[in-house]
């Protein structure tokens, strides 16, 4: 029960996190005009990963996309890449984790298979969250650097646009959304990994067994891969291992519940 709850919660937390990463990536407010020097500006500038915008006091808002690809700073391109990688990994992780959920039965999938899928999705969520946190942090660092370097003729980190003397940029809402979302995805991933341990069979690899046949002993390790991954050809409702097998230390190795498909 606790495992199911942990897995389910991990899935939900990751889902919220990935939705947040997508939202942050699409948001225009990655950097917003610093109003410290001019709190009563009639023109409010803000910029995202894909376009820059202006909100006028008239209520009119205009946005311009960064139509150049080669003209954009490498750092901005790197942030874009990190966020996209985070989204892609997160989306794949979500897909995998749906099938891995203990509360959902799909065909004759073994718990060991679900354990592996849970672990896979957990790792994907962790990497996705780290990508988002890294992307947002790189952008934040770029903003801090540009903030202190701002001069009348300086080119900022936004597509080489001329920075006028009274326009400096500070952290936008998207950065905070990205940090929180990345953190949630990371936490969700960790929860999935924890849930995986509870889902996995107690002994994934069976100990070597001795078959006493025709007067001599033959050591044999059956089905190690099958037991750990769940990918096997046996789909009938029967025991995989013969009860006559003995472990090397002569203790009976009974088939567990995981040996039934």
């Amino acid at each position: 029960m606790a495992v199911t709850a942990c897995q389910g919660l991990g899935f939900v937390v990751s889902l919220i996190g990935i939705a947040g990463i997508i939202a942050a990536t699409c948001m225009d407010q990655w950097s917003t005009q610093d109003l410290y020097n001019n709190p009563v500006t009639a023109v409010f500038n803000y910029q995202g990963l894909w376009r820059s915008c202006v909100r006028e006091s008239s209520g009119f808002t205009e946005c311009r996309g960064y139509f150049t690809l080669l003209g954009l700073p490498a750092m901005l391109q790197a942030v874009r890449a990190l966020m996209i990688v985070g989204i892609v990994l997160g989306a794949i992780g979500l897909l995998v984790s749906i099938f891995a959920l203990k509360c959902i039965r799909i065909g004759s999938m073994e718990d060991s298979a679900k354990a592996n899928m849970t672990l896979t999705s957990g790792i994907m969520f962790i990497v996705s969250g780290l990508c988002a946190i890294a992307g947002v942090s790189v952008f934040a660092n770029m903003l801090v650097t540009n903030f202190w370097m701002s001069t009348a003729n300086m080119y900022t980190g936004m597509g080489g646009m001329v920075q006028t003397v009274q326009t400096r940029y500070t952290f936008g809402a998207a950065l905070f959304v990205g940090w929180v979302a990345g953190g949630l995805t990371l936490i969700g991933g960790v929860m999935m990994c924890i849930a995986c341990r509870g889902l996995a069979p107690e002994e994934t690899n069976y100990k070597a067994v001795s078959y006493h046949a025709s007067g001599h002993s033959v050591a044999y390790k059956p089905g190690g891969f099958k037991a750990s991954t769940g990918f096997g050809s046996n789909t009938k409702n029967k025991k995989i291992y013969d009860g006559g097998a003995r472990t090397e230390d002569e203790v009976q190795s009974y088939p567990s519940k995981h040996d039934y498909v």
Partner: antibody
Amino acid sequence: EVQLLESGGGLVQPGGSLRLSCAASGFTFSSYTMSWVRQAPGKGLEWVATIIIGGSYTYYADSVKGRFTISRDNSKNTLYLQMNSLRAEDTAVYYCTRLVKGSAMDYWGQGTLVTVSS
Amino acid sequence: DIVMTQSPDSLAVSLGERVTMNCKSSQSLLSSGNQKNYLSWYQQKPGQPPKLLFYWASTRESGVPDRFSGSGSGTDFTLTISSVQAEDVAVYYCQNDYSYPFTFGQGTKLEIK
């Protein structure tokens, strides 16, 4: 047709108060930022105050800050300018204006004359 | 506050002549967000309220004759009338739309010789 009609101007003594009104028609009043601009006799234009669409933000010229209050009633399509502690230098024609793209003022009323004199 | 300075204060030209008037701001009016200059030009004829000619420094308001043109960027702006007509007699004002307080230039008075 867009129309802005100012009213409420007149002669007032220094230290007195006056409330100007601007009745708007021909457009969705609640969707526009509005301003007051004044022009002293024989002088240039001077921006007085601006109220943003929702009415949550107001901006004032330093010369009128603390004395004038801009407000709007979207249900009545009316813009107001409450003028207190009037001075002789407030004597001017007061225009009601509508802001559009570029924060430019595309429509102006005919103006109402406010004279502050003893 | 942004100070707007217009030059000349007045000018007298003959009909059909080309006229240029300037406006200088104490700070850049260029917005980095959309690369637009937040300056507008107004024409005020005697006894009338001002009329908007240009916004964003060079975007002509509808109904404004194409003999009028606006140009400039940053801190220096120009209003040009390619061929002055009698009805162009007026005072022309430039205005800072970039930050509050909105400020107007002192005006340039155009007369016919």
